[in-house]
């Protein structure tokens, strides 16, 4: 099924996708829609590059935050609330009868956690929890780390968006 | 709400062009994609093609060399042409659109004899 | 092309019983999959698209699961106007294709 990212209400989210540009500088068309990638296009589009720019978006809490010019499309959605959660497709709209790369991810947005952060997580989240963690303004900040991710349980994961408050991050679920 | 109608004939002669309309209420053929659809007397269904927004097309490969479709925005239609038909192409044949073909015509049954 | 291999061609079943429709691709499909509902005289009526999601104003009988190449379409609590043909369509590719259909009858 989709990926799951975990943000908190108020804090940004970051949703990844990246295509490679092929030759270099070759942009092609991106959408990013509310819900799963259709048949054609997306539904319900939220932002729209063309070959040269971003030339569509519904609201000014959408962005591309990445080098967009590389084939980095990930979706930044500032200022989350309870209805931002859901899946949303990233296309790729590469030309040809099969070339479109489809990407569903899934947001869910949680209430602010009302948890003292555990003084044992005041550390590097990114190492603590590699392929887990992604912020909004940096890109993701995921580790080629080998092994299976550590059993996180919701009261770790409502102490983890505690910590990242500030920076906006948003946790990623496998 | 979309609202799609087929027309054109209903009996064809073998190595003849079939043309059909699709007429569109409701939404404009400047926006989105706008679908062919045809469902053989056996219960089979063939996607044939589109044409889109910004007037683009793509065509099912099995079709590529007899057919074409086409638009008129100031009428908000669109056509399918289908040249050098067989017994082969009788089906009925529907108009459709939507992010998952939501939006169907309701059909028009071509038979294709002599 | 990738085939949508639909079972069973056809199927029988009582008001307010349950029946499953299956569809496997000849591929993995990604859970692009659709299922429609065919009536004589109208055009096919979207259910449910990505496998699962039942289209607005479709009942909660109706149900879809299913990933990689195996998917399946159930309805629970049949009603007399449930009878028709179902067919499955995959979307993971401009190469649409349809599965062979499904006529559901009353027993």
């Known amino acids: 099924s989709e990926v799951e990212y975990i943000a908190e209400v108020g804090q940004n989210a970051y949703l990844p996708c990246s295509y490679t540009p092929a030759p270099p500088g070759n942009l092609v068309p991106v959408c990013w829609g509310k819900g799963a990638c259709p048949v054609f296009d997306c539904s319900n589009v939220v932002l729209r590059t063309d070959n040269r720019d971003v030339n569509d978006r519904t609201s000014g809490r959408y962005w591309l935050k990445g080098d967009f010019h590389k084939g980095d499309v990930s979706l930044t959605i500032e200022n989350v609330t309870l209805a931002d959660s859901g899946v949303y497709c990233c296309r790729i709209q590469i030309p040809g009868i099969m070339n479109d790369e489809k990407h569903n991810v899934k947001l869910v947005v949680i209430k602010p956690a009302k948890v003292t952060p555990a003084p044992t997580l005041q550390r590097d989240l990114t190492s603590a929890f590699p392929r887990m963690l992604t912020t909004g303004e940096h890109g993701p900040a995921e580790t080629q780390t080998p092994g299976s991710l550590p059993d996180v349980n919701l009261t770790q994961i409502f102490t983890l968006t505690n910590e990242l408050r500030d920076s906006g991050a948003t946790i990623r679920t496998a | 709400e979309v609202q799609l109608q087929e027309s054109g004939p209903s009996l064809v002669k073998p190595s003849q062009t079939l043309s059909l309309t699709c007429s569109v209420t409701?939404?404009?053929?400047?926006?989105?994609?706008w679908n062919w659809i045809r469902k053989f007397p056996g219960n089979k269904l063939e996607y044939m093609g589109y044409?889109?927004?910004?007037?683009?097309?793509y065509y099912n490969p099995s079709l590529k060399s007899r057919i074409s479709i086409t638009r008129d925005t100031s009428k908000n239609q669109y056509y399918l042409q289908l040249n050098s038909v067989t017994t082969e192409d009788t089906a009925t044949y529907y108009c459709?659109?939507?992010?998952?073909?939501?939006?169907w015509g309701q059909g028009t049954t071509l038979t294709v004899s002599s | 092309d990738i085939q949508m291999t639909q079972s069973p061609s056809s199927l029988s079943a009582s008001l307010g019983g349950k029946v499953t429709i299956t569809c496997k691709a000849s591929?993995?499909?990604?859970?692009?999959i659709a299922w429609y509902q065919h009536k004589p005289g109208k055009g096919p009526r979207l259910l449910i698209h990505?496998?699962?999601t039942l289209q607005p104003g479709i009942p909660s009988r109706f149900s879809g699961s299913g990933s990689g190449t195996d998917y399946s379409f159930s309805i629970s609590n049949l009603e007399p106007e449930d009878f028709a043909t179902y067919y499955c369509?995959?979307?993971?590719?401009?190469?649409?294709?349809f599965g062979s259909g499904t006529k559901l009858e009353i027993k």
């Open positions: 409701g939404d404009s053929i400047t926006s989105g994609y």
């Open positions: 369509l995959q979307y993971d590719n401009l190469l649409f294709t």
């Open positions: 459709a659109t939507g992010n998952h073909f939501d939006y």
């Open positions: 044409i889109n927004y910004s007037g683009s097309t």
């Open positions: 990505y496998t699962s």
């Open positions: 591929q993995d499909i990604n859970k692009y």
